[in-house]
């Protein structure tokens, strides 16, 4: 129930990549505004995005305080221009979000190949260690800092002249692979958290090929 000119938010959805975390919901407001609250299971509610006409709220600053916590959000609906007004039960209408545990659920952003270097029949491929919005001691932590041993990378590589792909895996941000002399190769990488049940893999990085600027070739 509630006042006749407000409707409860619905389809509350967490959109999160590399811990940049936004709560989205419907409907687009007509004569109403929204306020969002977020809490851990054992914590107090904290209000964000006060009396907004947006249908999204950036909650990154709250969830990065402890990415291993489980969070719950709720969206309150108020009549526009009369935010003191409440529903028939004496409280504004609100809807709860699903629970969200950033460490287990944030999407892995598309990785980037930082560089590759060929020395003879070996190629070293380095993946950029992307910065997240998680802080420690006033510095932003990288994806590797946050996920540590839980994060691996998969490398897909193939000869420019063929379509047959090979794969390699690493627990670091570097690969060392064997290649055929005189052949050019193309590379793409994917971030993976094998222990997850959801959002286990990122999208593939842009393809980088030997003979282009990113790499370095040294014949030995």
């Amino acid at each position: 129930s509630g006042t006749t000119n407000t409707v409860a938010a619905y389809n509350l959805t967490w959109k999160s990549t590399n811990f940049k975390t936004i709560l989205e919901w419907e409907p687009k407001p007509v004569n109403q505004v929204y306020t969002v609250q977020i809490s851990t299971k054992s914590g107090d509610w904290k209000s964000k995005c006060f009396y907004t006409t947006d249908t999204e709220c950036d909650l990154t600053d709250e969830i990065v305080k402890d990415v291993k916590q489980t969070y719950l959000a709720r969206v309150f609906s108020y009549p526009a221009g009369n935010v003191e007004s409440t529903g028939s039960a004496g409280e504004p209408l609100y809807e709860n979000s699903p629970e969200f545990t950033p460490y287990l659920e944030t999407n892995l952003g598309q990785p980037t190949i930082q560089s590759f270097e060929q020395v003879g029949t070996k190629v070293n491929v380095t993946v950029e260690d992307e910065r997240t919005l998680v802080r420690r001691n006033n510095t932003f932590l990288s994806l590797r800092d946050v996920f540590g041993k839980d994060l691996i990378y998969t490398l897909y590589y193939w000869k420019s002249s063929s379509s047959g792909k090979k794969t390699a895996k690493t627990n670091t941000n570097e690969f060392l692979i064997d290649v055929d002399k005189g052949e050019n190769y193309c590379f793409s990488v994917q971030a993976v958290i094998p222990s997850r049940t959801v959002n286990r893999k990122s999208t593939d990085s842009p393809v980088e090929c030997m003979g282009q600027e990113k790499g370095e070739f040294r014949e030995i």
Epitope: Q69, T70, T101, L104, L141, D145, V146, G148, K149, N171
Partner: antibody
Framework: QVQLQESGAEVKKPGASVKVSCKAS????????IEWVRQAPGQGLEWMGE????????KYNEKFKGRVTMTRDTSTSTVYMELSSLRSEDTAVYYC??????????????WGQGTLVTVSS | QAVVTQEPSLTVSPGGTVTLTCRSS?????????ANWVQEKPGHGFKGLIS???NRGPWTTARFSGSILGDKAVLTLWGAHAEDEADYFC?????????FGGGTKLTVL
């Protein structure tokens, strides 16, 4: 505060199985790996395996593969370690442990009090 | 499986500095080994001092410091106290499993 409470001492016969429990409290149970480590009398520490309660993902020490099973019950925030085909060399104190996470850390910060398992005929 | 080696025993004078090392049979220890240092005191059980190479636990005094020195993980204790007398174990991560060292018995004498 973080606590890991293990089950009581067990005496088992060779060939039997033992199931040790580790009840966690004071933190988000699903997000932290629980490690199992044992210490035989007068010996050092030996890692047995780990489980991430949120997904039930496990990794086991090759030495124990086929004999060890780690499970969890999210409703009671409890992790279990079952070791089968017991032999006298399995007599040890069995510990569960959890890391201290502050942006990034992995391993063995918080420890249970240990469960003594004695294998004797 | 890798073998992790520690000094079996070390002695330090009260107020002195001591360095405990943790070597890997597979080569140089790196940050990808997420070196851990665990303290065992009789009657007190186990307590993690350092995890992820250099991250102190909330209870770990600043007198303990973890680092990588050359090809090994190192635990340095400055200004040793009598209560630091204990067994210290290191553990290293190898892609999909942990391996513990044999432990170092530290005597404060």
């Amino acid at each position: 505060q973080v606590q890991l409470q293990e089950s009581g001492a067990e005496v088992k016969k060779p060939g039997a199985s033992v199931k040790v429990s580790c009840k966690a409290s004071g933190y988000t149970f699903s997000s932290y790996w629980i490690e199992w480590v044992r210490q035989a009398p007068g010996q050092g520490l030996e890692w047995m395996g780990e489980i991430l309660p949120g997904s039930a993902s496990t990794k086991y020490n090759e030495k124990f593969k086929g004999r060890v099973t780690m499970t969890r019950d999210t409703s009671t925030s409890t992790v279990y370690m079952e070791l089968s085909s017991l032999r006298s060399e399995d007599t040890a104190v069995y510990y569960c442990a959890r890391d201290y996470y502050y942006g990034s850390s992995y391993g063995f910060a918080y420890w249970g009090q240990g469960t003594l398992v004695t294998v004797s005929s | 499986q890798a073998v992790v080696t520690q000094e079996p025993s070390l002695t330090v004078s009260p107020g002195g500095t001591v360095t405990l090392t943790c070597r890997s049979s597979t080569g140089a220890v790196t940050t990808s080994n997420y070196a851990n240092w665990v303290q065992e005191k009789p009657g007190h059980g186990f307590k993690g001092l350092i995890s992820g190479t250099n991250n102190r636990g909330p209870w770990t005094t600043a007198r303990f410091s973890g680092s990588i020195l050359g090809d090994k993980a190192v635990l340095t204790l400055w200004g040793a106290h009598a209560e630091d007398e204990a067994d210290y174990f290191c553990a290293l991560w190898y892609s999909n499993h942990w391996v513990f060292g044999g432990g170092t018995k530290l005597t404060v004498l």
